[in-house]
Protein backbone atom coordinates (compact mmCIF):
# COMPACT_ATOMS: atom_id res chain seq x y z
CA UNK A 1 0.00 0.00 0.00
CA UNK A 2 1.34 3.41 -0.98
CA UNK A 3 0.27 6.95 -0.17
CA UNK A 4 1.59 10.50 0.06
CA UNK A 5 4.00 11.13 2.93
CA UNK A 6 2.52 14.60 3.53
CA UNK A 7 -0.63 16.46 2.52
CA UNK A 8 -1.42 20.08 3.35
CA UNK A 9 -4.78 21.83 3.44
CA UNK A 10 -6.21 25.19 4.51
CA UNK A 11 -8.22 25.68 7.69
CA UNK A 12 -11.95 25.40 6.82
CA UNK A 13 -10.93 23.79 3.51
CA UNK A 14 -10.45 20.13 2.60
CA UNK A 15 -7.81 17.60 1.60
CA UNK A 16 -8.12 14.38 -0.36
CA UNK A 17 -5.60 11.62 0.23
CA UNK A 18 -5.21 8.89 -2.39
CA UNK A 19 -3.73 5.55 -1.38
CA UNK A 20 -2.83 2.80 -3.86
CA UNK A 21 -2.89 -0.91 -3.18
CA UNK A 22 -2.12 -4.22 -4.90
CA UNK A 23 -4.97 -5.80 -6.94
CA UNK A 24 -5.23 -8.72 -4.52
CA UNK A 25 -6.71 -6.41 -1.84
CA UNK A 26 -9.46 -5.15 -4.17
CA UNK A 27 -12.47 -6.28 -2.11
CA UNK A 28 -10.91 -5.87 1.34
CA UNK A 29 -12.15 -3.08 3.58
CA UNK A 30 -10.03 0.06 3.57
CA UNK A 31 -9.70 2.41 6.50
CA UNK A 32 -8.32 5.74 7.72
CA UNK A 33 -6.67 5.85 11.11
CA UNK A 34 -5.35 8.67 13.32
CA UNK A 35 -2.36 8.50 15.67
CA UNK A 36 1.42 8.58 15.73
CA UNK A 37 1.73 4.82 16.20
CA UNK A 38 0.40 2.24 13.74
CA UNK A 39 -0.45 -0.23 16.50
CA UNK A 40 -2.49 2.21 18.60
CA UNK A 41 -4.02 4.54 16.03
CA UNK A 42 -7.79 5.12 16.10
CA UNK A 43 -9.80 4.10 13.03
CA UNK A 44 -11.93 7.09 12.01
CA UNK A 45 -13.67 5.67 8.96
CA UNK A 46 -13.89 2.36 7.03
CA UNK A 47 -15.03 1.45 3.55
CA UNK A 48 -17.67 -1.26 3.13
CA UNK A 49 -15.58 -3.52 0.91
CA UNK A 50 -17.43 -2.19 -2.14
CA UNK A 51 -17.02 0.96 -4.23
CA UNK A 52 -19.80 2.75 -2.34
CA UNK A 53 -18.72 5.98 -0.65
CA UNK A 54 -18.93 6.01 3.17
CA UNK A 55 -19.37 9.28 5.08
CA UNK A 56 -18.86 10.05 8.76
CA UNK A 57 -18.99 13.64 9.94
CA UNK A 58 -16.33 15.60 8.09
CA UNK A 59 -14.76 12.43 6.61
CA UNK A 60 -15.56 10.33 3.59
CA UNK A 61 -13.87 7.30 2.03
CA UNK A 62 -14.35 5.91 -1.49
CA UNK A 63 -12.70 2.81 -2.86
CA UNK A 64 -12.02 2.84 -6.60
CA UNK A 65 -11.48 -0.90 -6.98
CA UNK A 66 -10.88 -0.79 -10.73
CA UNK A 67 -7.96 1.60 -10.25
CA UNK A 68 -6.77 -0.19 -7.07
CA UNK A 69 -6.83 3.02 -5.06
CA UNK A 70 -8.99 4.57 -2.39
CA UNK A 71 -9.55 8.21 -1.49
CA UNK A 72 -10.12 9.76 1.90
CA UNK A 73 -11.50 13.30 2.05
CA UNK A 74 -11.27 15.42 5.18
CA UNK A 75 -13.55 18.48 5.05
CA UNK A 76 -13.94 21.65 7.14
CA UNK A 77 -10.34 21.26 8.28
CA UNK A 78 -9.35 22.53 11.72
CA UNK A 79 -5.94 23.34 13.12
CA UNK A 80 -6.18 20.39 15.50
CA UNK A 81 -6.64 17.98 12.55
CA UNK A 82 -2.88 18.35 12.01
CA UNK A 83 -1.57 14.89 12.91
CA UNK A 84 -0.22 11.56 11.67
CA UNK A 85 -2.76 9.37 9.88
CA UNK A 86 -2.60 5.94 8.25
CA UNK A 87 -4.12 4.49 5.09
CA UNK A 88 -4.90 0.88 5.92
CA UNK A 89 -6.28 -2.34 4.50
CA UNK A 90 -8.12 -4.86 6.63
CA UNK A 91 -6.89 -8.38 5.95
CA UNK A 92 -6.47 -11.73 7.60
CA UNK A 93 -3.51 -11.57 9.96
CA UNK A 94 -1.81 -8.19 10.25
CA UNK A 95 -3.40 -5.22 8.47
CA UNK A 96 -1.38 -3.33 5.87
CA UNK A 97 -0.85 0.43 6.14
CA UNK A 98 1.17 3.46 5.16
CA UNK A 99 1.73 6.68 7.09
CA UNK A 100 0.40 10.05 5.90
CA UNK A 101 1.09 13.32 7.69
CA UNK A 102 -1.71 15.88 7.44
CA UNK A 103 -0.81 19.53 7.94
CA UNK A 104 -3.56 22.15 8.32
CA UNK A 105 -2.37 25.70 7.78
CA UNK A 106 -4.04 28.97 8.81
CA UNK A 107 -5.58 31.16 6.18
CA UNK A 108 -5.45 34.94 6.57
CA UNK A 109 -8.72 36.56 7.69
CA UNK A 110 -9.01 38.42 4.40
CA UNK A 111 -9.06 35.21 2.35
CA UNK A 112 -11.29 33.21 4.67
CA UNK A 113 -15.03 33.55 5.16
CA UNK A 114 -15.49 34.40 8.82
CA UNK A 115 -18.53 33.84 10.99
CA UNK A 116 -19.73 36.23 13.66
CA UNK A 117 -21.83 33.59 15.39
CA UNK A 118 -21.06 33.36 19.08
CA UNK A 119 -21.85 30.65 21.61
CA UNK A 120 -24.71 32.57 23.25
CA UNK A 121 -26.40 35.97 23.32
CA UNK A 122 -25.00 38.59 25.70
CA UNK A 123 -26.47 41.87 26.84
CA UNK A 124 -23.53 44.11 27.62
CA UNK A 125 -22.41 44.91 24.09
CA UNK A 126 -18.88 43.66 24.74
CA UNK A 127 -17.13 42.78 21.51
CA UNK A 128 -15.75 39.48 22.75
CA UNK A 129 -19.12 37.76 22.93
CA UNK A 130 -21.98 40.00 21.79
CA UNK A 131 -24.55 38.14 19.68
CA UNK A 132 -25.12 39.50 16.20
CA UNK A 133 -28.82 38.72 16.61
CA UNK A 134 -29.07 40.92 19.68
CA UNK A 135 -26.93 43.61 18.08
CA UNK A 136 -29.32 43.83 15.13
CA UNK A 137 -32.40 43.92 17.37
CA UNK A 138 -30.97 46.65 19.62
CA UNK A 139 -29.87 48.73 16.62
CA UNK A 140 -33.30 48.63 14.97
CA UNK A 141 -35.11 49.41 18.25
CA UNK A 142 -32.81 52.41 18.67
CA UNK A 143 -33.37 53.45 15.06
CA UNK A 144 -37.18 53.16 15.17
CA UNK A 145 -37.86 54.56 18.62
CA UNK A 146 -35.08 57.09 19.13
CA UNK A 147 -33.17 58.10 16.03
CA UNK A 148 -36.03 58.39 13.51
CA UNK A 149 -38.34 60.45 15.81
CA UNK A 150 -35.39 62.66 16.82
CA UNK A 151 -34.52 63.15 13.17
CA UNK A 152 -38.13 63.98 12.27
CA UNK A 153 -38.32 66.55 15.06
CA UNK A 154 -35.03 68.08 13.93
CA UNK A 155 -36.07 68.18 10.26
CA UNK A 156 -39.46 69.58 11.24
CA UNK A 157 -37.90 72.32 13.33
CA UNK A 158 -35.45 73.30 10.60
CA UNK A 159 -38.20 73.37 7.98
CA UNK A 160 -40.51 75.31 10.24
CA UNK A 161 -37.81 77.92 10.73
CA UNK A 162 -37.21 77.98 6.98
CA UNK A 163 -40.92 78.32 6.27
CA UNK A 164 -41.23 81.22 8.63
CA UNK A 165 -38.67 83.16 6.59
CA UNK A 166 -39.86 81.98 3.14
CA UNK A 167 -42.81 79.91 1.97
CA UNK A 168 -41.72 76.46 0.72
CA UNK A 169 -44.11 74.62 -1.64
CA UNK A 170 -45.54 71.45 -0.03
CA UNK A 171 -44.09 69.15 -2.72
CA UNK A 172 -40.58 70.51 -2.15
CA UNK A 173 -40.99 70.08 1.65
CA UNK A 174 -41.91 66.40 1.20
CA UNK A 175 -38.91 65.82 -1.08
CA UNK A 176 -36.51 67.43 1.43
CA UNK A 177 -37.85 65.32 4.29
CA UNK A 178 -37.60 62.04 2.33
CA UNK A 179 -34.08 62.65 1.02
CA UNK A 180 -32.84 63.60 4.51
CA UNK A 181 -34.35 60.45 5.95
CA UNK A 182 -32.91 58.29 3.17
CA UNK A 183 -29.40 59.63 3.66
CA UNK A 184 -29.62 59.10 7.44
CA UNK A 185 -30.80 55.49 7.02
CA UNK A 186 -28.16 54.80 4.39
CA UNK A 187 -25.43 56.12 6.66
CA UNK A 188 -26.69 53.89 9.46
CA UNK A 189 -26.67 50.82 7.18
CA UNK A 190 -23.06 51.49 6.27
CA UNK A 191 -21.87 51.93 9.84
CA UNK A 192 -24.17 50.48 12.56
Amino acid sequence: IQGPALVRGPEQGSVTVQCRYSSRWQTNKKWWCRGASWSTCRVLIRSTGSEKETKSGRLSIRDNQKNHSFQVTMEMLRQNDTDTYWCGIEKFGTDRGTRVKVNVYSVGKDTMSTSNQLPWPTVDGSTDMVSSDLQKRTYYMLLVFVKVPALLILVGAVLWLKRSTQKVPEEQWRHTLCSDLDSELLAKDISP
Epitope: M76, S115, W120, S131, D133
Partner: antibody
Protein backbone atom coordinates in the same frame (compact mmCIF):
# COMPACT_ATOMS: atom_id res chain seq x y z
CA UNK B 1 -41.64 27.15 18.25
CA UNK B 2 -38.09 25.89 18.65
CA UNK B 3 -37.86 22.11 19.05
CA UNK B 4 -34.91 19.72 19.28
CA UNK B 5 -35.61 16.02 18.75
CA UNK B 6 -32.88 13.49 19.50
CA UNK B 7 -32.34 9.93 18.33
CA UNK B 8 -33.29 6.96 20.53
CA UNK B 9 -31.41 5.12 23.30
CA UNK B 10 -28.24 3.17 22.47
CA UNK B 11 -26.69 0.10 24.05
CA UNK B 12 -23.05 -0.40 23.09
CA UNK B 13 -20.01 -2.44 24.03
CA UNK B 14 -16.70 -0.90 25.13
CA UNK B 15 -14.58 0.02 22.09
CA UNK B 16 -17.56 0.57 19.82
CA UNK B 17 -18.74 3.86 18.31
CA UNK B 18 -22.05 5.65 18.79
CA UNK B 19 -23.53 8.50 16.78
CA UNK B 20 -26.39 10.55 18.24
CA UNK B 21 -28.49 12.94 16.18
CA UNK B 22 -30.38 16.08 17.13
CA UNK B 23 -32.89 17.45 14.62
CA UNK B 24 -33.89 21.09 14.98
CA UNK B 25 -37.15 22.72 13.87
CA UNK B 26 -39.06 25.96 14.36
CA UNK B 27 -36.20 28.33 13.52
CA UNK B 28 -33.44 28.96 10.98
CA UNK B 29 -30.85 26.36 11.90
CA UNK B 30 -27.83 28.56 11.21
CA UNK B 31 -29.14 31.42 13.37
CA UNK B 32 -28.15 29.89 16.71
CA UNK B 33 -25.23 27.87 17.98
CA UNK B 34 -25.75 24.28 19.17
CA UNK B 35 -24.43 22.92 22.46
CA UNK B 36 -24.05 19.41 23.91
CA UNK B 37 -24.38 18.55 27.60
CA UNK B 38 -23.61 15.23 29.32
CA UNK B 39 -25.38 13.85 32.38
CA UNK B 40 -24.08 10.62 33.90
CA UNK B 41 -26.65 8.54 35.87
CA UNK B 42 -27.46 10.25 39.17
CA UNK B 43 -24.91 12.99 38.44
CA UNK B 44 -24.92 16.64 37.45
CA UNK B 45 -24.70 18.39 34.11
CA UNK B 46 -21.47 18.82 32.20
CA UNK B 47 -21.04 21.06 29.16
CA UNK B 48 -19.20 19.28 26.33
CA UNK B 49 -18.95 21.64 23.38
CA UNK B 50 -20.64 24.21 21.22
CA UNK B 51 -20.82 24.17 17.44
CA UNK B 52 -20.92 27.21 15.22
CA UNK B 53 -23.85 26.29 12.96
CA UNK B 54 -22.64 28.70 10.26
CA UNK B 55 -19.23 27.05 9.87
CA UNK B 56 -19.52 23.65 11.58
CA UNK B 57 -16.58 24.53 13.83
CA UNK B 58 -16.83 23.01 17.30
CA UNK B 59 -15.28 24.38 20.50
CA UNK B 60 -14.65 21.63 23.04
CA UNK B 61 -14.43 21.51 26.81
CA UNK B 62 -11.06 20.00 27.78
CA UNK B 63 -12.58 16.69 28.96
CA UNK B 64 -14.17 16.06 25.57
CA UNK B 65 -11.26 16.29 23.17
CA UNK B 66 -10.06 13.24 21.24
CA UNK B 67 -12.78 10.60 21.17
CA UNK B 68 -15.66 13.02 20.66
CA UNK B 69 -16.68 14.42 17.29
CA UNK B 70 -19.32 17.09 16.81
CA UNK B 71 -20.70 17.67 13.35
CA UNK B 72 -23.62 19.15 11.42
CA UNK B 73 -25.74 18.40 8.42
CA UNK B 74 -27.02 21.91 7.82
CA UNK B 75 -29.40 20.99 4.97
CA UNK B 76 -31.07 18.42 7.23
CA UNK B 77 -31.03 20.85 10.21
CA UNK B 78 -29.30 18.16 12.24
CA UNK B 79 -26.40 18.15 14.70
CA UNK B 80 -24.46 14.99 15.53
CA UNK B 81 -22.37 13.77 18.41
CA UNK B 82 -20.11 10.79 17.71
CA UNK B 83 -18.19 9.03 20.47
CA UNK B 84 -15.44 6.64 19.41
CA UNK B 85 -13.80 3.85 21.38
CA UNK B 86 -16.59 3.87 23.98
CA UNK B 87 -15.74 3.41 27.65
CA UNK B 88 -17.95 2.53 30.60
CA UNK B 89 -17.70 6.10 31.86
CA UNK B 90 -19.40 7.31 28.66
CA UNK B 91 -22.64 5.81 29.98
CA UNK B 92 -24.86 8.88 30.28
CA UNK B 93 -27.71 10.87 28.84
CA UNK B 94 -26.55 13.36 26.21
CA UNK B 95 -28.57 16.51 25.54
CA UNK B 96 -28.39 18.90 22.60
CA UNK B 97 -29.24 22.46 23.58
CA UNK B 98 -29.67 25.83 21.93
CA UNK B 99 -30.00 29.22 23.57
CA UNK B 100 -32.13 30.63 20.78
CA UNK B 101 -32.25 34.36 21.52
CA UNK B 102 -32.43 33.70 25.26
CA UNK B 103 -29.54 34.37 27.64
CA UNK B 104 -29.83 30.94 29.25
CA UNK B 105 -30.09 27.42 27.78
CA UNK B 106 -33.75 27.70 26.86
CA UNK B 107 -34.26 24.84 24.42
CA UNK B 108 -33.23 21.25 25.20
CA UNK B 109 -33.56 18.01 23.30
CA UNK B 110 -35.26 15.20 25.23
CA UNK B 111 -31.88 13.51 25.75
CA UNK B 112 -30.35 10.33 24.35
CA UNK B 113 -29.36 7.59 26.77
CA UNK B 114 -26.13 5.78 25.90
CA UNK B 115 -25.28 2.66 27.89
CA UNK B 116 -21.82 1.14 27.52
CA UNK B 117 -21.61 -2.38 28.90
CA UNK B 118 -19.74 -5.54 28.03
CA UNK C 1 -12.63 27.18 34.68
CA UNK C 2 -15.16 28.86 36.95
CA UNK C 3 -16.36 26.44 39.63
CA UNK C 4 -19.94 26.82 40.86
CA UNK C 5 -20.63 25.44 44.35
CA UNK C 6 -24.26 24.87 45.27
CA UNK C 7 -25.58 24.50 48.80
CA UNK C 8 -27.23 22.67 50.32
CA UNK C 9 -26.89 19.45 48.31
CA UNK C 10 -30.44 18.59 49.34
CA UNK C 11 -33.21 20.16 51.37
CA UNK C 12 -36.71 19.31 52.52
CA UNK C 13 -39.28 22.09 52.74
CA UNK C 14 -42.92 22.02 53.85
CA UNK C 15 -45.66 22.99 51.39
CA UNK C 16 -46.17 26.73 51.37
CA UNK C 17 -42.81 27.48 52.97
CA UNK C 18 -39.73 29.11 51.42
CA UNK C 19 -36.90 27.16 49.78
CA UNK C 20 -33.56 28.95 49.43
CA UNK C 21 -30.71 27.57 47.33
CA UNK C 22 -27.27 29.19 47.17
CA UNK C 23 -24.73 29.18 44.34
CA UNK C 24 -21.21 30.51 44.82
CA UNK C 25 -18.77 31.08 41.91
CA UNK C 26 -14.99 30.72 42.24
CA UNK C 27 -14.66 34.06 40.43
CA UNK C 28 -17.06 36.76 39.31
CA UNK C 29 -19.56 35.81 36.62
CA UNK C 30 -20.63 39.45 36.18
CA UNK C 31 -19.57 41.83 33.46
CA UNK C 32 -20.70 45.38 32.66
CA UNK C 33 -23.41 45.21 35.30
CA UNK C 34 -24.91 41.92 34.15
CA UNK C 35 -24.54 38.57 35.90
CA UNK C 36 -24.29 35.62 33.51
CA UNK C 37 -25.78 33.18 36.01
CA UNK C 38 -28.90 31.12 35.29
CA UNK C 39 -31.06 28.65 37.22
CA UNK C 40 -32.61 25.41 35.94
CA UNK C 41 -35.09 22.87 37.29
CA UNK C 42 -34.78 19.21 36.36
CA UNK C 43 -37.27 16.45 37.10
CA UNK C 44 -36.39 12.73 36.69
CA UNK C 45 -36.39 11.57 33.07
CA UNK C 46 -36.67 15.12 31.72
CA UNK C 47 -34.23 17.68 30.37
CA UNK C 48 -33.49 20.73 32.53
CA UNK C 49 -35.85 23.70 32.24
CA UNK C 50 -34.64 27.31 32.34
CA UNK C 51 -36.27 29.19 35.25
CA UNK C 52 -34.19 32.33 35.83
CA UNK C 53 -31.70 33.99 33.52
CA UNK C 54 -29.18 36.77 34.16
CA UNK C 55 -29.42 36.07 37.91
CA UNK C 56 -32.85 37.59 38.48
CA UNK C 57 -34.99 37.59 35.33
CA UNK C 58 -37.91 35.18 35.20
CA UNK C 59 -38.10 33.04 32.04
CA UNK C 60 -41.41 33.30 30.19
CA UNK C 61 -44.04 30.88 31.53
CA UNK C 62 -42.26 30.30 34.86
CA UNK C 63 -44.43 30.96 37.97
CA UNK C 64 -43.66 34.14 39.92
CA UNK C 65 -42.98 32.13 43.08
CA UNK C 66 -39.49 31.55 41.63
CA UNK C 67 -37.07 34.43 42.08
CA UNK C 68 -33.32 34.90 41.77
CA UNK C 69 -30.90 37.42 43.21
CA UNK C 70 -27.19 38.11 43.57
CA UNK C 71 -24.24 39.43 41.63
CA UNK C 72 -20.51 38.84 41.28
CA UNK C 73 -19.89 35.51 42.99
CA UNK C 74 -22.90 34.94 45.28
CA UNK C 75 -26.36 34.02 43.99
CA UNK C 76 -29.61 32.75 45.47
CA UNK C 77 -32.69 31.01 44.10
CA UNK C 78 -35.85 31.41 46.19
CA UNK C 79 -39.09 29.47 45.83
CA UNK C 80 -41.99 30.81 47.85
CA UNK C 81 -44.51 29.46 48.49
CA UNK C 82 -43.22 25.97 47.64
CA UNK C 83 -45.70 23.71 45.83
CA UNK C 84 -45.70 19.91 45.45
CA UNK C 85 -44.73 20.14 41.76
CA UNK C 86 -41.51 21.97 42.71
CA UNK C 87 -39.90 18.71 43.89
CA UNK C 88 -36.89 18.49 41.56
CA UNK C 89 -33.15 19.08 41.30
CA UNK C 90 -32.06 22.68 40.76
CA UNK C 91 -28.85 23.72 39.00
CA UNK C 92 -27.11 27.05 38.61
CA UNK C 93 -25.03 27.65 35.46
CA UNK C 94 -22.79 30.45 34.27
CA UNK C 95 -21.87 31.52 30.77
CA UNK C 96 -19.50 34.34 31.63
CA UNK C 97 -16.82 32.55 29.59
CA UNK C 98 -15.98 29.27 27.89
CA UNK C 99 -16.43 26.68 29.24
CA UNK C 100 -19.79 27.38 30.83
CA UNK C 101 -20.15 25.25 33.96
CA UNK C 102 -22.98 23.98 36.17
CA UNK C 103 -23.28 23.78 39.92
CA UNK C 104 -23.49 20.30 41.45
CA UNK C 105 -27.24 20.53 41.92
CA UNK C 106 -29.62 20.82 44.88
CA UNK C 107 -32.34 18.23 45.36
CA UNK C 108 -35.54 19.73 46.73
CA UNK C 109 -37.95 17.45 48.57
CA UNK C 110 -41.41 18.60 49.64
CA UNK C 111 -42.54 17.56 53.11
Amino acid sequence: QIQLVQSGPELKKPGETVKISCKASGYTFTDYSMHWVKQAPGKGLKWMAWINTETGEPTYADDFRGRFAFSLETSGRTAYLEINNLRNEDTATYFCVTYGSSYGMAYWGQGTSVTVSS
Amino acid sequence: DIVLTQSPASLAVSLGQRATISCRASKSVSRSGYSYLHWYQQKPGQPPKLLIYLASKLESGVPARFSGSGSGTDFTLNIHPVEAEDAATYYCQHNREIPPTFGGGTKLEIK
